[in-house]
């Protein structure tokens, strides 16, 4: 293993756990993750007497590095005293030392949040002659804090008298400003605001961002929607370029494929935004099979004012697959809105996150503008989920009280779709709703023709049905009653239900 310097941590008790009459108290210092041995731990106890004991080093199993603890026991007037633990590791370098200064015990406190903000560029997108960094130390329990600025890890000589502290309620905030020359800022150094508080160190770092992309201009490349890919079978991908400054030069968007094969003809659209910037989109039709087989597509953006081309690429998502579960619900009637009702659809536990959601009524797909669907969110362990919301009118549910929420997803089988039906008034057609649970799966058939699963209207028979004690020719579970719908002029539909 290569030489590794230790990380040093103070070990203290909670103040509330130390008896007020305690005549001596022990604190410690942990040096961990170093290699090779040894480390030297010494203590500065000020004017107090103390006895120290350094435990033998132990080996950390995974890394093979070492850890050791040094303990200091002090007696007398230790309550307000600060102690310094000094750890030296000569194998790292002859002068490698880490000092930790802390008190005997730690009070319950809220630690600070440390955040560095930087001044803006000028109107033309250029750095001004000086750059200001502002270190915000916020939300901590009032107490002494020390702020240090580091440049590439080295302490800077900064006038900290300008640091100001304010208190809001029970928490305090402090800010410190660092002014840098443009030359220093552009030199690619890292600047760190380091805060010491209650024996702990908190920090945030910043540096000039790498010019991987020209300032201000962003490009995004979308994957085809599952609906376009699996249902319409005409997938497209879109390259979107935003925040372009309108100018005489032309923005060029060029498409290519990683395989080197030719691309289809793309369509292009330019839009001037309210803030004066230009948005350019280019949409490329892709082959369904090419996409499913993992072809990578690239969009290259060039413009005379861009210092370099922007490149974006997209391909089918890798990783495991899981089909969505779909649950549809109707909200109860709300006072004052008897003629409107909200339907909700929870689609969950699918992977990857690409999904299309549709609502259907009367076997017709409703326009996307009718419903609102969230972006996929992680469930932390079992896939992604979305919610979709549809508002329906009385006229619609009186015409036909069945709405379908359909999810299109690559892992859904057999046809990449999963759907659930929902009614605004489930089961009210045949009288009062009963409390038994409707069967999980309700099958219907006409004559010998097996039909699709059909909702049994909750647990209540259709008004044109009569219930009997099961029929010998019905292939379903014997424990369920059978209901025969006596539809005029048609072969009777037979379905199981709880009558």
């Amino acid at each position: 293993a290569s030489t590794q310097s230790p990380s040093v941590f103070p070990l203290t008790r909670c103040c509330k756990n130390i008896p007020s009459n305690a005549t001596s108290v022990t604190l410690g210092c942990l040096a961990t993750g170093y290699f090779p041995e040894p480390v030297m731990v010494t203590w500065d106890t000020g004017s107090l007497n103390g006895t120290t004991m350094t435990l033998p080093a132990t080996t950390l199993t995974l890394s093979g590095h070492y850890a050791t603890i040094s303990l200091l026991t002090v007696s007398g007037a230790w309550a307000k005293q600060m102690f310094t633990c000094r750890v030296a590791h000569t194998p790292s370098s002859t002068d490698w030392v880490d000092n930790k200064t802390f008190s005997v015990c730690s009070r319950d406190f809220t630690p600070p949040t440390v955040k560095i903000l930087q001044s803006s560029c000028d109107g033309g997108g250029h750095f001004p002659p000086t750059i200001q960094l502002l270190c915000l130390v916020s939300g901590y329990t009032p107490g002494t804090i020390n702020i240090t600025w580091l440049e590439d890890g080295q302490v800077m000589d900064v006038d900290l008298s300008t640091a100001s502290t304010t208190q809001e309620g029970e928490l305090a905030s402090t800010q410190s400003e660092l002014t840098l020359s443009q030359k220093h800022w552009l030199s690619d150094r890292t600047y760190t605001c380091q805060v010491t508080y209650q024996g702990h160190t908190f920090e945030d770092s910043t540096k000039k961002c790498a010019d991987s992309n020209p300032r201000g201009v962003s490009a995004y490349l979308s994957r085809p929607s599952p609906f376009d890919l699996f249902i319409r079978k005409s997938p497209t991908i879109t390259c979107l370029v935003v925040d372009l400054a309108p100018s005489k030069g032309t923005v060029n968007l060029t498409w290519s494929r990683a395989s080197g094969k030719p691309v289809n003809h793309s369509t292009r659209k330019e839009e001037k935004q309210r803030n004066g910037t230009l948005t350019v989109t280019s949409t490329l039709p892709v082959g369904t099979r090419d996409w499913i087989e993992g072809e990578t597509y690239q969009c290259r953006v060039t413009h005379p004012h861009l210092p370099r081309a922007l490149m974006r690429s997209t391909t089918k998502t890798s990783g495991p697959r899981a089909a969505p579960e779909v649950y549809a619900f109707a909200t109860p009637e709300w006072p004052g809105s008897r003629d409107k009702r909200t339907l909700a659809c929870l689609i969950q536990n699918f992977m990857p996150e690409d999904i299309s959601v549709q609502w259907l009524h009367n076997e017709v797909q409703l326009p996307d503008a009718r419903h609102s669907t969230t972006q996929p969110r992680k469930t932390k362990g079992s896939g992604f989920f979305v919610f979709s919301r549809l508002e329906v009118t009385r006229a619609e549910w009186e015409q036909k009280d069945e709405f379908i929420c359909r999810a299109v997803h690559e892992a859904a089988s057999p046809s990449q779709t999963v759907q659930r039906a929902v009614s605004v008034n489930p089961g009210l057609a045949g009288g009062s709703a009963q409390s038994q649970r409707a069967p999980d799966r309700v099958l219907c058939h006409s004559g010998q023709q097996q039909g699709l699963p059909r909702a049994a209207g909750g647990s209540v028979p259709h008004p044109r049905c009569h219930c009997g004690a099961g029929r010998a020719d019905w292939p379903g579970p014997p424990e369920l009653d059978v209901c025969v719908e006596e539809a005029e002029g048609e072969a009777p539909w037979t379905w199981t239900g709880l009558c």
């Epitope: 995974l62 890394s63 990783g319 362990g381």
Partner: nanobody
């Protein structure tokens, strides 16, 4: 651009061992927690194991505890999964994965490799 490439899969007899590797590129490997995920044929995906940036903290699914060991070599930008005492139920595609936010336990990860097939059969 984050790229992960698994290798080391193959056919092995029950009780045997395999070592999977995952070569990472396009990001600062040492700054990211890493994980292994698997999916058996016809089953839902299953998180297998995770390791923190420094390699000191590791977590395992109950089904592999004591048999699988996750490790990493930040100098080589490589993640490993040592699989011992393999069982037929370990047959699956194995992916190495990472995430911008959280990779120290079950998750839907932001980035996956292409996967490597492990078949445990006599």
């Amino acid at each position: 651009e984050v790229q992960l490439l698994e290798s080391g899969g193959g056919l092995v007899q029950p009780g045997g061992s395999l070592r999977l590797s995952c070569a990472a590129s396009g990001f600062t490997f040492g700054n990211y927690d890493m994980a292994w995920v698997r999916q058996a044929p016809g089953k839902r995906p299953e998180w297998v194991s995770s390791i923190d940036t420094g390699g000191d903290i590791t977590h395992y699914a109950d089904s592999v505890k004591g048999r699988f060991t996750i490790s990493r070599d930040n100098a080589k930008n490589t993640l490993y999964l040592q699989m011992n005492s393999l069982r037929p139920e370990d047959t699956a595609v194995y992916w190495c994965a990472t995430d911008e936010e959280y990779a120290l336990g079950p998750n839907e990860f932001d980035y996956y490799g292409q996967g490597t097939l492990v078949t445990v059969s006599s």
